[in-house]
């Protein structure tokens, strides 16, 4: 025997009363599939979340983050504060990258400049808080009289971070 509830379309739920099989979802609730026994409460985009798509009787609201924050997690379930390039987020707020490290994103953490000498190369362009160094040809490849920029840089061997 077919379940009578299976006839209830999205946007409705299956009532217990025999005379009233399919009941529209009440305000601020939805059902996205047919045959549901109850409607789900709409997601509310509050605080650092803002509404990207309003809730309807057949689909949940969708949120994103307010300016100055970025989404994390499925369906933007979390918002994390942005920082500027050249910074990283700590509990005390956005902090500039330490000398010898950089961050080219508005999120994430600073990481050390590449140590060009580990690859037998020289520094072509100095690193900054926002950008990694650019490595050039090895010192031996440079023509006589040419010099490369060689600022002090922390080692960037795998597994080692600046302290």
């Amino acid at each position: 025997l077919q379940d009578p509830c299976s006839k209830c379309p999205a946007g409705t739920f299956c009532g217990k009363n025999k005379n009233q099989i399919c009941i529209p979802c009440p305000p601020n609730s939805f059902s996205s599939t047919s045959g549901q026994k109850a409607c789900d409460i709409c997601r509310q985009c509050k605080g650092v979340f803002r509404t990207r798509k309003e809730c309807s009787s057949t689909s949940n609201a969708e949120c994103d983050c307010t300016p100055g924050f970025h989404c994390l997690g499925a369906g933007c379930s979390m918002c994390e504060q942005d920082c500027k390039q050249g910074q990283e987020l700590t509990k005390k707020g956005c902090k500039d990258c330490c000398f010898g490290t950089f961050n080219d994103q508005k999120r994430g953490i600073c990481r050390p400049w590449t140590n060009c000498s580990l690859d037998g190369k020289s520094v072509l362009v100095n690193g900054t808080k926002e950008r990694d160094v650019v490595c050039g040809p090895s010192p031996a490849d440079l023509s006589p009289g040419a010099s490369s920029v060689t600022p002090p840089a922390p080692a960037r061997e795998p597994g080692h971070s600046p302290q």
Epitope: G73, E80, G108
Partner: antibody
Framework: QVQLVQSGAEVKKPGESLKISCKGS????????ISWVRQMPGKGLEWMGK????????NYSPSFQGQVTISADKSISTAYLQWSSLKASDTAMYYC?????????WGQGTLVTVSS | DIELTQPPSVSVAPGQTARISCSGD??????AHWYQQKPGQAPVVVIY???NRPSGIPERFSGSNSGNTATLTISGTQAEDEADYYC???????????FGGGTKLTVL
């Protein structure tokens, strides 16, 4: 949608080498850290290390430094965890997770069994 | 590196409040995050940055963090909350993530 899909379960003998993988999709793989987390049978979560796929910079937990190698190939959005010589004590579930502090997406886990 | 200590187990009657502690030297100076793990599943964030709750996580979950202790509180605990819970923090000394040993929450 964002997904991290890990390679299948492995059964190995002590002394053998192994490389397991974690393929990311649905986001800019190069610009998010990937961490590896170990869970031995019936035990808790242990953070092993992380990699920034954009430039393959790695950072290890002192407990795992020199024991494993983390790498990535950003061209195929895949991170790797490898051992050169497995031990019975490496038997565990290994998870990859996106992030360095907040791990917002996790792989399904790769079960590694090392037994003679 | 910082060490995070959790009680191995906590038991609570349905409808009661469960509190799971996570202690570590000056953990209040760092963000604490909490994960729930059910058998055979990957962990899921239930609290991030000390006190923030991801959407989709019930309002009964809350968190706090100050001094040497971070706390996960589950008010009106339900049977479905039975799981292992892990605290974690990212430390800028060593640039590593540390997990607590985990707490098995049993709903009686």
């Amino acid at each position: 949608q964002v997904q991290l899909v890990q390679s299948g379960a492995e059964v190995k003998k002590p002394g053998e080498s192994l490389k397991i993988s974690c393929k990311g999709s649905g986001y800019s793989f190069s610009t998010y850290w990937i961490s590896w987390v170990r869970q031995m049978p019936g035990k808790g979560l242990e953070w092993m290390g992380k990699i920034y796929p954009g430039d393959s910079y790695t950072n290890y937990s002192p407990s795992f430094q020199g024991q494993v190698t983390i790498s990535a190939d950003k061209s195929i959005s895949t991170a790797y965890l490898q051992w050169s010589s497995l031990k019975a004590s490496d038997t565990a579930m290994y998870y990859c997770a996106r992030g360095y502090g907040i791990f917002d997406y996790w792989g399904q886990g790769t079960l590694v069994t090392v037994s003679s | 590196d910082i060490e995070l200590t959790q009680p191995p187990s906590v038991s609570v009657a349905p409808g009661q409040t469960a509190r799971i502690s996570c202690s570590g030297d000056n953990i209040g100076d760092q963000y604490a995050h909490w994960y729930q793990q059910k058998p055979g599943q990957a962990p899921v964030v239930v609290i991030y940055q000390d006190k923030n709750r991801p959407s989709g996580i019930p309002e009964r979950f809350s968190g706090s963090n100050s001094g040497n202790t971070a706390t996960l509180t589950i008010s009106g605990t339900q049977a479905e909350d039975e799981a292992d819970y892990y605290c974690s923090t990212y430390t800028f000394v060593g640039f590593t993530t540390v997990f607590g040993g985990g707490t098995k929450l049993t709903v009686l």
